[in-house]
């Protein structure tokens, strides 16, 4: 007799989730010598322990503490790039500018990037059928709590000038309900972070508007200023040229505004 299973509104756990996490961990520790000491089996056990046998709407940051401890990593605090709704370009940027880091360039962010997972209360099974949706079901689900936890820690670790890449094509360039707007902005430490510099990425080829004057950017400026952190904003009119100039800064066309 098939056992009754809770039907959630979101997609189920990514197929081959345990194998994917383990494989990513092995790959990451091979590429990053400073993380070679990490025991990937222990990392998987801690990851699994955070959500297996627990109600997927009742996950806490505390559940992830063993994983956080195992994944402890020192990132140069003045080389942090945050992003909101523009992940691909942010990742392309740090692939070229190798001394800068997004959350997904850290071990824990790399392990979970683009994956979904959840378990079921009182059973050791992983739920591959469905997982809670943040809006329709509950916010304290395994995936949301994970990203909230690692994002908070990543923001708390930042210092000096912190950069954030924002999508200028969206109606809300700065969205206070995004992970950046709801978690990271509020966990930057004013005693450590000197300036938040926003890079607003333009989508349209002929878009010459100053998106730094957008009302949502003004809202971000206000939030940051109230926290006694300085604010700066730059328009990136040509993201393609921007990346090209990061690759080849000596190029003569890279002195003009991008």
């Amino acid at each position: 007799v098939p056992r009754w299973r809770q039907q959630w509104s979101g997609p189920g756990t990514t197929k081959r989730f345990p194998e994917t996490v383990l494989a990513r961990c092995v790959k990451y520790t091979e590429i990053h010598p400073e993380m070679r000491h990490v025991d990937c089996q222990s990392v998987w056990d801690a990851f699994k322990g955070a959500f297996i046998s627990k109600h997927p709407c009742n996950i806490t940051e505390e559940d992830y503490q063993p994983l956080m401890k195992l994944g402890t990593q020192t990132v140069p605090c003045n080389k942090i790039l945050l992003w909101s709704r523009i992940k691909d370009l942010a990742h392309q940027f740090t692939q070229v500018q190798r001394d800068m880091f997004t959350l997904e360039d850290t071990l824990l962010g790399y392990l979970a990037d683009d994956l979904t997972w959840c378990g079921e209360f009182n059973t050791s099974k992983i739920n591959y059928q469905s997982c809670p949706d943040w809006r329709k079901d509950c916010s304290n689900n395994p995936v949301s709590v994970f990203w909230k936890t690692v994002s908070r820690r990543f923001a708390e670790a930042a210092c000096d000038v912190v950069h954030v890449m924002l999508n200028g094509s969206r109606s809300k360039i700065f969205d206070k309900n995004s992970t950046f707007g709801s978690v990271e902005v509020h966990n930057l430490q004013p005693e450590k972070v000197q300036t938040l510099e926003a890079w607003v990425i333009h989508g349209g080829r002929e878009d010459s508007r100053d998106l730094c004057q957008d009302p949502t950017i003004k809202e971000l400026e206000s939030i940051i200023s109230k926290r006694n952190i300085q604010f700066s904003c730059k328009n990136i009119y040509r993201p393609d040229k921007f990346l090209q100039c990061v690759k080849n800064p000596e190029d003569s066309s890279c002195t003009s505004e991008i």
Partner: antibody
Framework: QIQLVQSGPELKKPGETVKISCKAS????????MNWVKQAPGKGLKWMGW????????TVADDFKGRFAFSLDTSASTAYLQINNLKNEDTATYFC?????????WGQGTLVTVSA | DIVLTQSPVFLAVSLGQRATISCRAS??????????MHWYQQKPGQPPKLLIY???NLESGIPARFSGSGSRTDFTLTINPVEADDVATYYC?????????FGGGTRLEIK
């Protein structure tokens, strides 16, 4: 190149007021806060506080609250330190230094002498 | 406030030898593995010059004879080999927690 240039030495009497300037060049002034550091003759360094050059919000260390004030003229990329009701123990060299919390850029220092 | 205790207060070293200056903080100055401890050199009549930031990062333009190490509460500035131009007072400074504080200084002289 980045430079912080401070105003010249001052000789003041007790009870008077002095205002020291620190003019920044070579970078966007409003991107980095400005700190003030005191060094009494033959003594060590003491952080007085800093001013947020974007908002103008000053943070004054407890030991300097009351007679010491930080201000800005953003259009001139200049930060100011004002000391009111000068006392003999205010005799010192005052440095401006650019944030972040480690100071790679310093002004040359302004010697303030308080003497009757 | 975080108190920084430097030792020794005076240090005399022969040219070409190693100089080691210690700085102990009254509480940890670490944040997620980054140590907010910095080192400066000051010569008479001049402003301090940043040598090392965040415990072990060599400031641009500073010779590699200068190095910094340590974490949490115990930090060391090493000069190896010492040159005549290194005669100065050296200060540690923390920016982990306001108010930022400096150590009392260490005067380096040549034996």
């Amino acid at each position: 190149q980045i430079q912080l240039v401070q105003s010249g030495p001052e000789l003041k009497k007790p009870g008077e007021t002095v205002k020291i300037s620190c003019k920044a060049s070579g970078y966007t002034f409003t991107n980095y806060g400005m700190n003030w550091v005191k060094q009494a003759p033959g003594k060590g360094l003491k952080w007085m506080g800093w001013i947020n050059t974007y908002t103008g919000e000053p943070t004054v260390a407890d030991d300097f609250k009351g007679r010491f004030a930080f201000s800005l003229d953003t259009s001139a990329s200049t930060a100011y330190l004002q000391i009111n009701n000068l006392k003999n123990e205010d005799t010192a060299t005052y440095f401006c230094a650019r944030n972040p919390g480690w100071f790679a850029y310093w002004g040359q220092g302004t010697l303030v002498t308080v003497s009757a | 406030d975080i108190v920084l205790t430097q030792s020794p207060v005076f240090l005399a070293v022969s040219l070409g030898q190693r100089a080691t200056i210690s700085c102990r903080a009254s509480e940890s100055v670490d944040n997620y593995g980054n140590s907010f401890m910095h080192w400066y050199q000051q010569k008479p009549g001049q402003p301090p010059k940043l040598l090392i930031y965040r415990a072990s990062n060599l400031e641009s333009g500073i010779p590699a004879r200068f190095s910094g190490s340590g974490s949490r509460t115990d930090f060391t500035l090493t000069i190896n080999p010492v040159e005549a131009d290194d005669v100065a007072t050296y200060y540690c400074q923390q920016s982990h927690e306001a108010p930022w504080t400096f150590g009392g200084g260490t005067r380096l002289e040549i034996k």
